[in-house]
């Protein structure tokens, strides 16, 4: 058993049938000696009276906010939540594998630029008695500060029969120079509590490793003379750090009509102008990447041919 | 300990070329040894992070650009001396910061061609001759320490009497290929930086 | 399987014209742009223009502008070329290639001999 | 125009043993390049596609590199069907132009 915050506390449990469970022993937070019982939850069974309660956690029915009482009088509360290992695995209910970029991936972050900044999100279809506290460092030996927001539910999505929920929350390292090379990588760590079911999530990664720019901006086309031709020209999105000659960004250029088994042309830049064939019902799409270690592309930004 | 703007004319700088290659090079090198080497721990993930030049040379902070200098967090730099009669600017007006920042990067080419020339003698005598460093690579580090044209003192190359451990010598290369890979970037980064000021 | 079937080998007279043909099976006609490549003998491959069958768009290289024209036929899945004013230089091997991806192409004709002599 | 140039034009090779040809554009083409392997009498064959993308059903053996204006293919180990010619292409603007080709024999 260990602490998660004050008076909420942690039961590691080995979850197979006939487990025999943890034992564990709860103290009334008072100066008090006598006349103190203790009750779970609502109910007003009375479970054992003394300043501490020995019990036998081995499931959730034995889980709960434990009271200690005097003479109708609340002394304090302990909150026992359940952390489930099975087959000597933590289990991983309250939050969906979005499989991307492998398997077994809970949390995804992404950083539009070098400056410390990332955002994490991850996805439950979970919609109720639901919450996450996010912790994240630089290193794990010698940890050096990042400082996180509250997560917060940022989209609802309808996937089939499930409603799906995204949660996302954004971080910046406390000390960063875009500059450096990183060679310790910041570290994740997410608390989520359902109900009185304990679990916990991590990612580990560099900010290099995670940089997806914002699609260029300022998209613009000048029709060359006498050509089918059209010269599309854009500029690099606000977000991305700067000097750019220093953080460079290439770029991927496309015509293509609305589906994308249509014939298309494309053309890679690292100028902020290309020219390109333009067709009728098409549209001019470009996307960026930094030019000098790949990640992810940007998303597209696109303007009709016509 | 940051690079001023007034730089050479666009076209004055040989390096920015041969930057280009070196990353291209030892991208395609590491990504040839995590092909070869799928059985060892050669993925960003799996190996520790060494930089063979801490403490020995300060390229980053040296060659820090100058709208980055403003940012307190970039500035914590070691002092170190370096050799400042680098060519590769072909300029008169080679700055004292330019010169400390393309002799850091020097230094640190000499450092790693030392380490890769001493790995491939020792990855040249595994019996399983598994994997060995692209020669292409090697040309292209000595074809940017020429352009950049700094003299100093040459590292001896090291030799081991006892018998290579074949396994750790390819653990050390995917190391050193991760460290060399991301200041092949910070080096692409610093000549394109100058090539624009 | 996508195929690009070329006409036979033609033999012209200097100043005369040549009409090559090359006629795709697999995939919709429309669906790809449609390029010419010449080989002359000994000779490295030269990029001539290519059509959009869609809507007849074209794009020819400069040194054959004027002199070359490329046409398609959707009913027949059916593309062609033809070159003017033809003179001993144009004896080559011309071969159509087509893709979805304008500027590259992955499926090539197997090449029609067009020999310019007097 | 953008000019390609090849090298070497003809590169004898001894069946098994790896092989690599160069390409440099007359100016920076980004990745806009492409490989195509071409037998006499034969259409020629798409092998890579912006300089490094690997094609539906062509060997692994066949890999591209390079950006800007240098660019290499390299065949890991020579197989007797080969032997050919290779030429590159780039697509950074029109006309679209072809190196001169190099030729790969056995030694």
């Known amino acids: 058993i260990w602490e998660l915050k004050k008076d909420v506390y942690v039961v590691e449990l080995d979850w197979y049938p006939d487990a025999p469970g943890e034992m564990v022993v709860l103290t009334c937070d008072t100066p008090e000696e006598d006349g103190i019982t203790w009750t779970l939850d609502q109910s007003s069974e009375v479970l054992g009276s003394g300043k501490t309660l020995t019990i036998q956690v081995k499931e959730f029915g034995d889980a709960g906010q434990y009271t200690c009482h005097k003479g109708g009088e609340v002394l304090s509360h302990s909150l026992l939540l359940l952390h489930k290992k099975e087959d000597g695995i933590w289990s991983t209910d309250i939050l969906k594998d979005q499989k991307e970029p492998k398997n077994k991936t809970f949390l995804r972050c992404e950083a539009k630029n070098y400056s410390g900044r990332f955002t994490c999100w991850w996805l439950t279809t979970i919609s109720t008695d639901l919450t996450f506290s996010v912790k994240s460092s630089r290193g794990s030996s010698d940890p050096q500060g990042v400082t996180c927001g509250a997560a917060t539910l940022s989209a609802e999505r309808v996937r089939g029969d499930n409603k799906e929920y995204e949660y996302s929350v954004e971080c910046q390292e406390d000390s960063a120079c875009p500059a450096a090379e990183e060679s310790l990588p910041i570290e994740v760590m997410v608390d989520a509590v359902h109900k009185l079911k304990y679990e916990n999530y991590t990612s580990s990664f560099f900010i290099r490793d995670i940089i997806k720019p914002d699609p260029p901006k300022n998209l613009q086309l000048k029709p060359l003379k006498n050509s089918r031709q059209v010269e599309v020209s854009w500029e690099y999105p606000d977000t991305w750090s700067t000097p750019h000659s220093y953080f460079s960004l290439t770029f991927c250029v496309q015509v293509q009509g609305k589906s994308k088994r249509e014939k298309k042309d494309r053309v890679f830049t690292d100028k902020t102008s290309a020219t390109v064939i333009c067709r009728k019902n098409a549209s001019i799409s470009v996307r960026a990447q930094d030019r000098y270690y790949s990640s992810s592309w940007s998303e597209w930004a696109s303007v009709p041919c016509s | 300990r940051n690079l001023p703007v007034a730089t050479p004319d666009p076209g004055m700088f040989p390096c920015l070329h041969h930057s280009q290659n070196l990353l291209r090079a030892v991208s395609n090198m590491l990504q040839k040894a995590r092909q070869t080497l799928e059985f060892y721990p050669c993925t960003s993930e799996e190996i520790d992070h060494e930089d063979i030049t801490k403490d020995k040379t300060s390229t980053v902070e040296a060659c820090l650009p100058l709208e980055l200098t403003k940012n307190e967090s970039c500035l914590n730099s070691r002092e170190t001396s370096f050799i400042t009669n680098g060519s590769c600017l072909a300029s008169r007006k080679t700055s004292f910061m330019m010169a400390l920042c393309l002799s850091s990067i020097y230094e640190d080419l000499k450092m790693y061609q030392v380490e890769f020339k001493t790995m491939n003698a020792k990855l040249l005598m595994d019996p399983k001759r598994q994997i060995f460093l692209d020669q292409n690579m090697l040309a292209v580090i000595d074809e940017l320490m020429q352009a950049l044209n700094f003299n100093s003192e040459t590292v001896p190359q090291k030799s081991s009497l006892e018998e290579p451990d074949f396994y750790k010598t390819k653990i050390k290369l995917c190391i050193l290929l991760h460290a060399f890979r991301i200041r092949a970037v910070t080096i692409d980064r610093v000549m394109s930086y100058l090539n624009a000021s | 399987q996508v195929q690009l079937v070329q006409s036979g080998a033609e033999v012209k007279k200097p100043g005369s014209s040549v009409k090559v043909s090359c006629k795709a099976s697999g995939g919709t006609f429309s669906d790809y742009y449609l390029h010419w490549v010449r080989q002359a003998p000994g000779q490295g491959l030269e990029w001539m223009g290519w059509i959009d069958p869609e809507n007849g768009d074209t794009e020819y290289a400069p040194k054959f502008q004027g002199r070359v024209t490329i046409t398609a036929d959707e009913s027949t899945s059916t593309a062609y070329m033809e070159l003017s004013s033809l003179r001993s230089e144009d004896t080559a091997v011309y071969m159509c290639?087509?893709?979805?991806?304008?500027?590259?192409?992955?499926?090539w004709g197997q090449g029609t001999l067009v020999t310019v002599s007097s | 125009d953008i000019v390609m140039t090849q090298s070497p034009l003809s590169l004898p090779v001894t069946p098994g043993e790896p092989a690599s040809i160069s390409c440099r554009a007359s100016q920076s083409i980004s990745i806009n390049l492409h490989w195509y392997q071409q037998k006499p009498g034969q259409q020629a064959r798409l092998l890579i596609a912006?300089?490094?993308q690997s094609i539906s059903g062509v060997p692994s053996r066949f890999s591209g590199s390079g950006s800007g204006t240098d660019f290499t293919l390299t065949i890991s180990s020579l197989q007797p069907e080969d032997f050919a010619t290779y030429y590159c292409q780039q697509s950074n603007s029109f006309p679209l132009t072809f190196g001169q080709g190099t030729k790969v024999e056995i030694k």
């Open positions: 912006f300089a490094s």
């Open positions: 290639a087509r893709n979805k991806e304008l500027r590259y192409f992955d499926v």
